[in-house]
């Protein structure tokens, strides 16, 4: 990936709207050292995006990609 | 493909106040931030401020009682509003994208820029 | 506000490894500045090279590399070529807002 990289991620604000379920196939949460606590989702095309993890479309989405 | 497209007055006489549109096209308002940044003749980048996809803003805290920024994610278009304009605010503004990420590069894609001259 | 200050030109030949630096006057940068460096070229033309201290953006040569050198950022072009004769601004985080350098004048002789 170009964004390879040994420092950690962290998400400066987060999407407003929510992103297709099909188009993503994983998630991690930021670590806790992040200023703003996140979830990134990463899509089929490995681009990552920053959500609030307090909104529910977000924990639908966890849930969904845990059981999946 | 990204493009952000930046229009503005071109002449604005001192005390008055200045807006500059920026259009932006190949992404969503609601996925990214937009940021200003200007740059006097013959000086550096100095760093405006921003808007993030859910409308919180963040400042350069030297110039935020004058700066206002805002935007209208359905037409695609972000504004910058700065008041009390002085002779020493003629630059070149410019609208870049910011993605959300932090191990991602800030300002990716920058606008072509318009030129501000504040004048009499 | 912070104060970011980087070389104000360098000059080196085809072929030649190059570093620039951003220093800020708060202190060491760390990871946490998220260091970024944009290059303009004539016409106002700006891109980003590099976010995040150290990742390339997508399409930027990889003779273009971030790094932390003792308490400075770091870009080093390993290899210059003639086009990479630029300015090259860097940029630093500072919880809330960013802070650009003055700017390092890159010139590429040959």
């Known amino acids: 990936s170009p964004y390879s990289s040994d420092t950690t991620p962290c998400c400066f604000a987060y999407i407003a709207r929510p992103l297709p379920r099909a188009h993503i196939k994983e998630y991690f949460y930021t670590s806790g050292k992040c200023s703003n606590p996140a979830v990134v989702f990463v899509t089929r095309k490995n681009r990552q995006v920053c959500a609030n993890p307090e909104k529910k479309w977000v924990r639908e989405y966890i849930n969904s990609l845990e059981m999946s | 493909q990204v493009q952000l497209k930046e229009s503005g007055p071109g002449l604005v006489a001192p005390s008055q106040s200045l807006s500059i549109t920026c259009t932006v096209s190949?992404?969503?308002?609601?996925?990214?931030?937009i940021h200003w940044v200007r740059q006097p003749p013959g000086k550096g980048l100095e760093w405006l401020g921003v808007?993030?996809?859910?409308?919180?803003?963040n400042y350069n805290s030297a110039l935020m009682s004058r700066l206002n920024i805002s935007k209208d994610n359905s037409k695609s278009q972000v504004f910058l509003k700065m008041n009390s304009l002085q002779t020493d605010d003629t630059a070149m503004y410019y609208c870049?994208?910011?993605?959300?990420?932090?191990?991602?590069?800030?300002?990716?894609?920058w606008g072509q820029g318009t030129s501000v001259t504040v004048s009499s | 506000q912070a104060v970011v200050t980087q070389e104000s030109a360098l000059t080196t030949s085809p072929g030649e490894t190059v570093t620039l630096t951003c220093r800020s006057n708060?202190?060491?940068?760390?990871?946490?500045?998220?260091a970024n460096w944009v290059q303009e070229k004539p016409d106002h033309l700006f891109t980003g090279l590099i976010g995040?201290?150290?990742n390339r953006a997508p399409g930027v040569p990889a003779r273009f590399s971030g790094s932390l050198i003792g308490d400075k950022a770091a870009l080093t072009i390993t290899g210059a070529q003639t086009e990479d004769e630029a300015i090259y601004f860097c940029?630093?985080?500072?919880?809330?807002?960013?802070?650009f350098g003055g700017g390092t004048k890159l010139t590429v002789l040959g």
């Open positions: 995040g201290t150290n």
């Open positions: 940029a630093l985080w500072y919880s809330n807002h960013w802070v």
């Open positions: 808007i993030w996809p859910g409308g919180g803003t």
């Open positions: 708060t202190g060491a940068v760390t990871t946490s500045n998220y």
């Open positions: 190949g992404f969503s308002l609601t996925g990214y931030g």
């Open positions: 870049a994208r910011g993605p959300l990420i932090t191990t991602e590069v800030s300002m990716d894609y």
